[in-house]
Every structure is written in C-alpha cells, then in structure tokens.
Interface confidence: low
C-alpha cells in the first residue's frame, strides 16, 4: 500500500492495533523490512507499507484526522471530501476525523445530505456499522453532542467555537463520500442547535449533550423540529435527571412560530406538549449547579409525528359554487392567553395546505378538514354582498338572508354572517322583514336568544348603528334609507338547533328620506322597549328616524319615555320629536333641546313617533329610550 499526504493538507493518518482479538497469529505493519504495530503518516509524507498477514482488518484500524483551522485564515466551507480516497486506503475499519477550530463568535453548521442521521444511545449500534460521532467544545472542554446512524431525521447540527466529527466506516463498507458539508453561521449563543426534519409520520429519539453523563452546567441546547403542517408532533420524555441547582432553574422551553405565548416554559417533570401542528423548537436550559453536590442534568426524549386523530380524518365540502360575492373565513376565536401550552389548531384546504385561518370565496366547491384538538377554538365569519346597480331591475325584488345549510353543517361555530346590502344612491331604499317579529336589545330587556341581527349603516363615512335585534319581539319590519350591513351574530352553540328561527327577507323599495322606519306591532302580553339608533354614541347629526306603532282596536297603548330631558345640546339647528295620531293626523311637537320629554301618554289608535336630530355639541348627544305597553280598553272611545 502507498499513502501520500499532500503538504499543507493538515491530515494525519494513524494505523494502529484495534481491539485485541484472540487470534493466535500476530500481525504487523511491514515497512522497510521493519515490523511495527503502529504507523503515523503526516502531511507531506509518502509511505509504502504492507501487512504481514492476510486479514489485517482483524488486527488493525486506520484513523484519518484532518485539522481545519478557522482561527488564522479562511475556512474551507462546503462539501467535505474523504481524503485520502477510500480506494487508496487498506481495507481496515476506518475512522475519518475532522477537527474544526473556530472563534467563539463563529457558528459552524454541519449539513447532512439524505439519508439524514438518527441518534443512538449508549450501548446501541448502527445496523450498517457506519456511525457519526459529533462533539463540540466549551473552552478547553470537549462536549459529546451524540452518536448517530444513517436513516433518521437529523439534517443539520449547529455549533460554535469548534466541532469534531468522526465518521466510522467498517472495512467492508463501500462508502466513498463524507455525506456532509460545513457552513459558517453567525453565533448561535448556545452549545448547539440540532435540526430534525420529518417528511411524514415517524419518530425520533434524541438526547442532551454528554448523555448519559451530565449536560454541561448552565448551558443551553436547542432542537428545531420541521414538521409538515398537516401532521402532529408530541413530545415525551423517556429519561431525565435533574441536577442540584444553586441558581436558576433547569427547564425546557418550547417555541412555536405564530404562538403568542412564546416561549412556553416547562419543568422536566411536567407532562410535555402533544398534538402540535407544524414546526417547533425545544430548548434545554441548565442551571448553576451546587459546587459541593452538583448532581447531573440529562434528558432523553422522543418526538412522535403522526397524522392527527378523529376530526382531522373527515373531509367537509363547502359548496359556494352557486354563491356570488361571498367569503367565508375560519379563524381562531380570540382567547385570553394563559401560560399553559396550547397545541396548534389548523384548518386545511384539500388536506394539504394548513393554516391557522382560511378564507374560502364564492364560485367554487371547497374541501376542508381540521387539525385541531378542540374545534371550539375556531369560529367562522362570513360576508356576502347583495348589491343592486340598476334600480329599474331591482325594485321590489326580494332576497332571503339565510345562512346556507353547508355552512351550518361545518363542525365550527358560526360567529358572524354579514350581509352587505347595497343600493343605488337616492334611487332605492331597503326593507327588512323578519320571519318572526324582532325584539330590540336594550339594557332593560336584553335579548337572550342564541343569535341576533346587528343592523348598521354600510356607508363608510356614516357611523350609524340601528341596533341589535333578536326573534321574539314586536318589530315587524325595518326600513332603511341606504346601504346597510345586517350581521347575524351567534351567542351560543345552541344556534344550530335554533337556526330554523333565523329568516330575514330584504326587499328593494322606492327611495325615502328618513334614515330608518321601524314598524312595531306590540303584543298585549309584554312591554316593548325601543331606543334610538347609535345608543351610547348618540343619534348622528341631522338624522331622522320614525317608529310606526300599531294599536289594535280593542287596546290602548301607553308611551313612556325613560328620562325627563333628552340631554341634547344643539350647536346648529333644532332637535325635535313629533308624535302623530295616524287616524286624525293630530300631532304634538316637542323641542328636544329645550322641552322636557312628555309624561306617559295613552294612544287609542296607531301612531307615529318621529325623532329628528340637530347638530349636537360634542358630549351632549341624543339618546332616547321609550316603551310601549298595550292594555285592553275599558271603554270604547271610537
């Protein structure tokens, strides 16, 4: 055999006796007729030798060490070569060692081409005999990062200050490439970072540095896991020991991209998180140990990546192919953050693209599934626009404002379904007619149904909220002058059962000038509470609204206002209220910015209440609450 090492190659080859065997006949390296048991070849040397036996692999091993100095000059980064080539070496068990020394401020990254690496614990061996032993250093101390076989998940290992990589190849192994490259990185400010990539289901067992011995004092080690979004990862600790801490606390920290509570801190004895969707990092942080009785910190853990269970295997079809101008968003409902780890919750399109929120648009059929431990963490918001561009075509046309059944069948709670109703300016107005008469939500008589309709102006410059209305009241219809949004908002999961109670029809009607007209047909059984739009903020300037209140022939209506004065102070114009009997047209006019509000009044026939605002001074707004109560007539006054 001839081994020639180029000058400046910084390579040393050592052939030495391996583990002694019980073979009777000894074997020697023969060089210049001398018989030796160890041969060292340095850079720039050329040596010819043979062996005195036919099976030297049973006696000798060869170590090829290359020192790479990144302290004094540039580093030879890139793919690492096997030098000398394995074909030039005797067929012995061989270990290639690369010893890279670098500044503390420089990060070094080992990148492993496929197949990636699998870490093994003490006493384990690799099936093909090929092992990778990786160590780093802290000052002068060598730290074992771990021993690895092929066919695993570890794709990159980042260290700083230096790295020693030993690749052990059995004599019969044909491998002639190192299988890794070295790159420089910025400082990682910790002992090492191990990246583990899962491309499908699988598991990985990983260990803290120096395992089963103690993890270096007060050090930090991070594992980065790359997991496809449609799979779930769970962490379980197989074995750990805690040292005796003098300062700080030994802990593991999870960092989950996109989480609002990073980092999630766990004690080693805690139950570790499961059902994580997508990528995450896990870090082990040591402490300052007691000098007298340090103990040891060590950790062996398993990451299991698998398809999620239960709900995630179901595919839901959302057919929006016959819909127009509609979008459906599934997103996380706002929650108060807690320190507790919260597994990911994802919605997937075609089971492939998974994200924490998803918007589906009209015109297509969508297949979705869920990756979520608890679907109550998600909700749906839907927007649909119904617009009329040609008043000649739309007039008297009606549309049903109903939540499509496809949406109701999804396993996620509907939060809002908003209809934006758009009309040509000054040409048409809108009327909303509910399937069941509506009650206006007030503090005095709040809605307690599982859903309400929130009606508001949809004109960007206009801050006008008509109110919140739920089924089971006395409001027969609501007429509005111009563009509005009607939002069905659910308040309880029982909406699914009560969905049949929803039902609102919108019709395009000839234009009228008032902002809104409420048609009220009170029932004899209850008191109807009504309040002006924009409650709490005040009726907008120069806005006029009316209530058309029906009084049955055999009843009398008592109209009651809930404060003595309106409280409005006008900057310009006048605020007034007109109460007009519909039969006789007799009317009373009240100046709201001056007069006291009327005392309770009795009406034997249907009547109008019209309230018109001035331009109020800020802070002195117009808010009125009134009630209508029917009682049977005792005397016929017709």
């Amino acid at each position: 055999f001839e081994i020639a090492l180029p000058r400046e190659s910084n390579i040393t080859v050592l052939i030495k006796l391996g583990t002694p065997t019980l073979l009777a006949k000894p074997c020697y390296i023969v060089i210049s007729k001398r018989h030796i048991t160890m041969l060292s070849i340095k850079s720039g040397e050329r040596i010819v030798f043979t062996f005195s036996c036919q099976s030297p692999e049973n006696h000798f091993v060869i170590e090829i060490q290359k020192n790479i100095d990144c302290m004094s000059g540039p580093c030879p980064f890139g793919e690492v070569q096997l030098q000398p080539s394995t074909s030039l070496l005797p067929t012995l068990n061989r270990t290639f060692i690369w010893d890279v020394k670098a500044h503390k401020s420089i990060g070094l990254e080992l990148q492993f081409s496929i197949p990636r690496l699998r870490q093994i614990g003490p006493g384990e061996s690799c099936p093909d005999g090929v092992t990778h032993s990786i160590s780093g250093r802290i000052d002068a101390t060598v730290v074992r990062i771990g021993t690895f076989c092929s066919n695993g998940t570890v794709s990159r290992i980042k260290m700083q200050e230096g790295v020693k990589m030993a690749l052990h190849l059995p004599w019969f192994h044909p491998r002639n490439v190192s299988g890794f490259s070295i790159a420089n990185r910025s400082s990682i400010k910790r002992l090492c970072i191990i990246e583990s990539v899962f491309e499908g289901e699988g598991s990985a067992t990983l260990m803290s540095a120096n395992y089963p011995e103690g993890f270096p004092e007060d050090e930090l080690m991070t594992w980065q896991f790359v997991v496809p979004a449609h799979l779930r990862a769970s962490v379980s600790f197989l074995n750990f020991n805690l040292s005796n801490c003098e300062r700080k606390e030994e802990r593991v920290e999870y960092y989950i991209p996109g989480s609002t509570t990073n980092p999630e801190v766990f004690k080693l004895e805690d139950k570790q998180p499961g059902n994580m969707a997508g990528n995450f990092n896990l870090s082990l942080q040591g402490c300052d140990q007691d000098a007298q009785s340090p103990g040891i910190l060590r950790l062996q853990f398993q990451v299991l990546v698998q398809h999620p269970q239960n709900e995630s295997n179901k595919i839901y079809v959302v057919d929006l192919s016959n819909e127009r101008a509609m979008s459906l968003t599934i997103e996380p409902r706002p929650v108060k953050q807690s320190r507790k780890f919260v597994p990911g919750c994802f919605v997937c399109l075609e089971s492939r693209t998974c994200s924490s929120n998803l918007t589906l648009t009209s015109g297509s059929k969508h297949k979705i599934s869920f990756l979520c431990d608890d679907l109550t963490r998600l909700w749906m918001n839907v927007e649909k626009t119904i617009s009329c561009t040609d008043h000649r075509y739309c007039q008297r046309k009606s549309y049903s404002l109903q939540v499509p059944s496809d949406i109701l069948h999804l396993p996620v709670e509907l939060h809002d379904f908003s209809w934006k109703l758009l009309v040509p300016k000054d040409r048409l107005s809108l009327v909303l007619v509910p399937a069941q008469k509506l009650q206006q939500h007030t503090h005095e008589k709040p809605c307690n149904t599982s859903f309400s309709y929130l009606v508001a102006s949809a004109i960007p410059s206009q801050d006008l909220y008509f109110g919140s209305f739920c089924p089971g009241g006395s409001i027969k219809q609501i007429q509005v002058k111009q563009n509005i949004s009607v939002t069905l908002r659910t308040f309880a999961p029982s909406f699914q059962q009560e969905a049949s109670r929803q039902g609102l029809t919108v019709s395009f009607i000839p234009y009228f000038k008032e902002e809104g007209v409420f048609t009220v047909t009170p029932d004899t059984k209850s008191k109807v509470y009504l309040r002006t739009p924009n409650w709490d903020r005040g009726l907008p300037s120069l806005t006029s609204v009316s209530w058309n209140i029906s009084v049955p022939r055999d009843q009398v209506a008592c109209l009651t206002f809930f404060k003595e004065r309106s409280g409005v102070v006008c900057q310009t114009g006048r605020a007034f209220m007109i109460i007009q009997e519909q039969r006789t047209r007799a009317e009373e006019i009240f100046s709201l910015d001056e007069d006291v509000l009327p005392k309770p009044s009795f009406h034997h026939h249907s009547f109008w209440v019209n309230i018109s605002n001035c331009s109020p001074t800020s802070g002195k707004q117009l808010d009125l609450l009134f009630s209508v109560t029917l009682t049977p007539r005792t005397v016929d006054l017709t």
């Epitope: 300062r247 700080k248 609002t260 300052d288 706002p334 108060k336 953050q337 320190r339």
Partner: antibody
Framework: QVQLQQSGSELKKPGESVKLSCKAS????????MHWVRQAPGQGLKWMGW????????TYADDFKGRFVFSLDTSVSMAYLQISSLKSEDTAVYYC????????????WGQGTLVTVSS | EIVLTQSPATLSLSPGERATLSCRAS??????LHWYQQKPGQSPRLLIK???QSISGIPARFSGSGSGSDFTLTISSVEPEDFAVYYC?????????FGQGTKLEIK
C-alpha cells in the same frame, strides 16, 4: 403596531385627585400585564406596581399603597391610575408599561403623563 | 427589596469608544436583570433582557453579561445617538427595582 397612549399633562392642587389613562392598541390588553412606573423630576425610575389585566387584581409596591389605585376597562383597552389626596412629592412623570406577570421586562412604554402638584 | 447600584454615575466618552456600565445587586438575582435606555424627554426603551438576551430592533453593539449579583452592559463602539441614561432593573421578586441610572455623556 403595539402602542400605549397616555393622557395629557395634569396640573393639580394638593389634596385633589387625578386619574391618568393608558390606552393599549396593537395587541390584546388582557394578554399582558400592565405596570406603572414613576419618575420624579431629575430622578430615576421607580416601579409602582402592576395590574393583572385578566383578573383586574392590582399589586402595589409598599410606597404606593393607599392613595394609588390601578384599574381597567378592558372593553376599551384602557388601564387607569388614580391618585387621591395629591401631595407635592407626587409631582412626576407616570409611565404605563407592558409586561408579563411571569416575564417581567417592559417591552413597550407609554409616552408618560406629567402630573404637577402645586398650590 | 433588591437594591441595585449602578456605576459609574456618569461616564464621559467620545463616539467610537467602548462603554462598560456596571450594575450590582444587593443579593443574587440569577439572570433576572434587564437594561433600559432613556433619552431626555422620552420613555425608557428595553435594550437587554435577562442579563444577556438581545432584543429585536436593538443594535448589535449593545450586549449584556453577568449573573448572580454583578452585571455589565457593554456598548462596543458608542454612536452619537447612544448618549443617554441607562437603567438596570431587577425582575427577581417584588418589588421590581431600578438602579439609580448611569448617564453616558459626550466627552
């Protein structure tokens, strides 16, 4: 982006009360605790205490027990500091700052409110 | 309560020089120490958390070190905009306390 917007300067007489506000935007108020820090003219920073924005429970440093009250209105993302029976030594800039009860560094601060107490 | 003592009270340097600010705690506080910068008329700004952890958006010339009771804030090469008052803060236990501040001024 995260912002803490504090109310404007106040000039008060000894014995009066003042209520300072701090409006949180760009994040959910209840996700982080709110801390109050005082800085007297030409002096350093002094931590007054904090309020748990989830539960509304306040914690006061010893020097700020009694006349100082932290409160919240989560519906409008507001934190408040009320000081009663003002004294001239309460003259200072008062800062609200965002922290976490278990991660107590203050990553965002309000611009401060100067309270001047003078007869 | 934890008393934090900062030194020096004033540090006079020229731009480009290295600044070393010290903060000593009256008892061991592990790494529960944060550093803030305050310019005249402005709110404090978080520079370093947990003794040595950098904050995104803060220039890399600011670094922190120390654990236990002795801590250091280092500005590797002072820039004109770095002249300000620097405070350390203990977050070890209630009440949280601040040091009295170190004023970094132009020489």
């Amino acid at each position: 982006q995260v912002q803490l917007q504090q109310s404007g300067s106040e000039l008060k007489k000894p014995g009066e009360s003042v209520k300072l506000s701090c409006k949180a935007s760009g994040y959910t108020l209840t996700d982080f605790s709110m801390h109050w820090v005082r800085q007297a003219p030409g002096q350093g920073l002094k931590w007054m205490g904090w309020i748990n924005t989830e539960t509304g429970a306040p914690t006061y440093a010893d020097d700020f027990k009694g006349r100082f009250v932290f409160s919240l209105d989560t519906s409008v993302s507001m934190a408040y500091l009320q000081i009663s029976s003002l004294k001239s030594e309460d003259t200072a800039v008062y800062y609200c700052s965002r922290g976490r009860d278990y991660d107590p560094h203050f990553d965002y601060w309000g611009q401060g409110t100067l309270v001047t107490v003078s007869s | 309560e934890i008393v934090l003592t900062q030194s020096p009270a004033t540090l006079s340097l020229s731009p480009g020089e290295r600044a070393t600010l010290s903060c000593r705690a009256s008892q061991s506080i592990s790494d529960f120490l944060h550093w803030y910068q305050q310019k005249p008329g402005q709110s404090p700004r978080l520079l370093i958390k947990y003794a040595s952890q950098s904050i995104s958006g803060i220039p890399a010339r600011f670094s922190g070190s120390g654990s236990g009771s002795d801590f250091t804030l280092t500005i590797s090469s002072v820039e004109p905009e770095d002249f300000a008052v620097y405070y350390c803060q203990s977050a070890h236990s209630f009440p949280y306390t601040f040091g009295q501040g170190t004023k970094l001024e132009i020489k």
